[in-house]
């Protein structure tokens, strides 16, 4: 019996087609992805093949103005239109709290939404009962297939799930649910979830009875043969893991942003054992036409976005200096504003010993692309912020050793004075540079804000200590020459859309007046 698994993950609000780098589509003839194009390909496969499942491994939420405006209603609407068969909850599905998951998505999805390792307690337990499930048995042709869901147990540090959801260890939570499916004589089981490729492989290895793992969170690109675009494969598709009980378990993921449709064909014997598996992600490029009816629906929903981008979010009573002449040479108040917003967006009081789990922010000055003048009645709009942060990036959470941070700050000024983008703006950090010293030895003082303290204060950076830092995904990926961050980071979790973080902060504060306050000094 043959099953075709079509899968997406980490779509992050890319409902419209995008450029090759998943930013805003500029030249339509070279654009990719989007739900209208995805629908064309899915329907083509459904017509050609008998047993097809369309699955999503989480993080539909967060990433463009679509999510900012529609808050998840767009996800339910278009996933319903594409007739997804099941979805696993990702960490970003909790970005607007549990209510922001329940009302727009859980109540409106016409397909099951899954996670076995999230347990509700207190008053939430009855409210959310039945709206998401640990597993689902789906009819496929004349057979049934079991799908078990899972979600990163780091979600309380990455999003806003509140205090009434407990995120358990994935493997511990999955095994009894798989066992239940086995007692129901369901012998073909897919683990669908959002914990990253390393955990996907562990689940394949450790959870008895799982036949296939469809994952997300780490934006992993797997491919067999010559890759069709810029993404470099982390391994073959499918990636085969040998389980502890000796089975070959295919593990797949389909990069991110709806650029590819994962396509995996699995052959099962009559006892539900995987005989063979093969496939590849399908690049959704312009050779695949956009479905006209879905495209028309997208255009209808778009109207509200255009109106939103010119509405006032808040006011500034000071000039927001985002000029290259400032942000690439010294502390600039636009950099301070953005870093303060980044920290504010990551306030998670999950431990009594810590006032917060993260206190530090770094931001490449080259990523700040425009100032905002206060003389327009102080008004700040989404459109203004899109000029400051035009690249459609995210502000991510990483863990780094102090020694890596020291290297990063040396890199920040290794060729100071040439208006290059690597000069770092900061939050929760006091740095002093001596430019008379040779490159690689210019940081004379680096103090960081404590987290395990009731009164935050600045202490000298410790080289061997592990620190959490919020930074742009561009830096986490080694951009602007920050190779040491990419090479030495100990953990990397994708965060919220950059503009969304700053706009939320400005809306919350209502009136802002960021200052230049001595975060960066020269001796």
């Amino acid at each position: 019996w043959e099953l075709t698994i079509l899968h997406t993950n980490d779509v992050h609000s890319r409902l419209e087609q995008t450029s090759e780098d998943s930013s805003k589509c500029v030249n339509a003839s070279r654009c990719m992805g989007g739900v209208a194009r995805l629908f064309t390909k899915v329907q083509q496969i459904r017509r050609a093949e008998p047993n097809v499942l369309l699955l999503d491994a989480g993080d539909q939420y967060q990433g463009t103005i679509w999510f900012t405006v529609y808050k998840g209603a767009e996800v339910a609407h278009f996933m319903n239109a594409l007739r997804y068969d099941a979805m696993a909850l990702g960490n970003h599905e909790f970005d607007n709290g549990v209510e922001g998951l329940i009302e727009p998505l859980l109540k409106e999805a016409k397909f099951p939404i899954l996670s076995a390792n999230i347990k509700a307690k207190g008053p939430l337990a009855s409210q959310i009962s039945g709206l998401y499930l640990p597993y689902k048995v789906l009819p496929v042709g004349d057979e049934v297939v079991g799908i078990v869901g899972y979600t990163s147990k780091e979600t309380p540090f990455l999003s806003n799930p509140g205090t009434n959801l407990v995120f358990e260890d994935e493997i511990t939570a999955l095994q009894p649910e798989v066992d239940k499916l086995k007692t129901l004589n369901v012998n073909k089981i897919i683990a669908l979830g959002h914990s990253g490729f390393e955990m996907d492989k562990l689940i394949a290895q450790k959870v008895r009875g799982v036949d296939v793992v469809v994952g997300g969170h780490s934006n992993t690109f797997l491919y067999t043969g010559n890759p069709p675009s810029k993404e470099v494969p982390a391994g073959k598709y499918p990636f085969i893991v040998t389980s502890d009980d000796g089975r070959k378990v295919p593990v797949v993921q389909a990069y991110a942003f709806g650029k590819y449709l994962g396509y995996l064909k699995i052959e099962f014997d009559e006892r539900g054992n995987v005989i063979s598996s093969h496939g590849n992600p399908i690049l959704l490029n312009s050779s695949i036409p956009e479905d006209p009816s879905i495209k028309a629906d997208i255009n209808k929903w778009r109207i509200k976005l255009d109106n939103y981008s010119t509405q006032e979010l808040g006011k500034t009573i000071v000039y927001l200096d985002g000029s290259s002449q400032s942000c690439r040479f010294r502390e600039c108040n636009m950099g301070n504003l953005i870093c303060d917003a980044m920290i504010n967006n990551n306030l998670r009081h999950t431990d009594e010993m810590f006032w917060n789990h993260v206190s530090m922010c770094i931001l490449n000055g080259g990523g700040i692309r425009s100032p905002i003048d206060e003389r327009n009645n102080g008004t700040i709009t989404w459109e203004n912020l899109a000029a400051v942060l035009p690249f459609g990036g995210t502000f991510d959470l990483v863990q780094l050793k102090g020694s890596t941070l020291k290297k990063a700050f040396e890199h920040s000024v290794h060729r100071y004075g040439q208006s290059t983008g690597e000069f770092l703006q900061v939050g929760g950090i006091h740095v002093v540079y001596d430019l008379s010293r040779k490159p690689g030895d210019r940081v004379v003082k680096l103090d960081v804000l404590c987290t395990k303290c009731r009164v935050p204060s600045y202490d000298p950076l410790k080289m061997d200590e592990v620190y959490k830092v919020i930074l742009p995904n561009f830096l986490a990926n080694g951009g602007d020459g920050f190779q040491m961050i990419k090479d030495e980071l100990l953990r990397h979790d994708s965060g919220d859309q950059d503009i969304n973080v700053v706009s939320t902060y400005i809306s919350k504060m209502k009136v802002i007046y960021p200052a230049v306050e001595g975060r960066i000094k020269f001796s």
């Epitope: 109540k107 016409k110 397909f111 099951p112 499930l133 689902k136």
Partner: nanobody
């Protein structure tokens, strides 16, 4: 919470008719596939009929084809099973069940929510 309540069961003579109702509360009916199942004394639960969320497609077990009709009134959040030409072998407890998804099914494993059942006896 999601609830399904069946009604309309009773004693009927062979060749007679009954109309079972399944009233759904706690969710919108048009998001759910609904199935009718029955369990005769000492036998396995078996699928009788199912209706897709849109109401556009219906399935019937071979044993009831041409005699039973499933229908839904989404406005009233109610699903019906019209049973004609009843036979003694149609006797049992009839359950309605629901699940979110696109494809109706007669496989009980697919259904997530169940009613308490209503008893149907076909006897002279």
């Amino acid at each position: 919470a999601l609830q399904l309540v069946e009604s309309g069961g009773g004693l009927v003579q062979p060749g007679g008719s009954l109309r079972l109702s399944c009233e759904v509360s706690g969710f919108t009916l048009d998001y759910y596939n609904i199935g009718w199942f029955r369990q005769a004394p000492g036998k396995e639960r078996e699928g009788v009929s199912s209706s897709s969320a849109s109401g556009g497609s219906t399935y019937y077990a071979d044993s009831v084809k041409g005699r039973f009709t499933i229908s839904r009134d989404n406005a009233k959040n109610t699903v019906y099973l019209q049973m004609n030409s009843l036979k003694p072998e149609d006797t049992g407890v009839y359950y309605c069940a629901a699940y979110r998804g696109w494809h109706p099914s007669l496989d009980a494993r697919v259904y997530d929510y169940w009613g308490q059942g209503t008893e149907v006896t076909v006897s002279s």
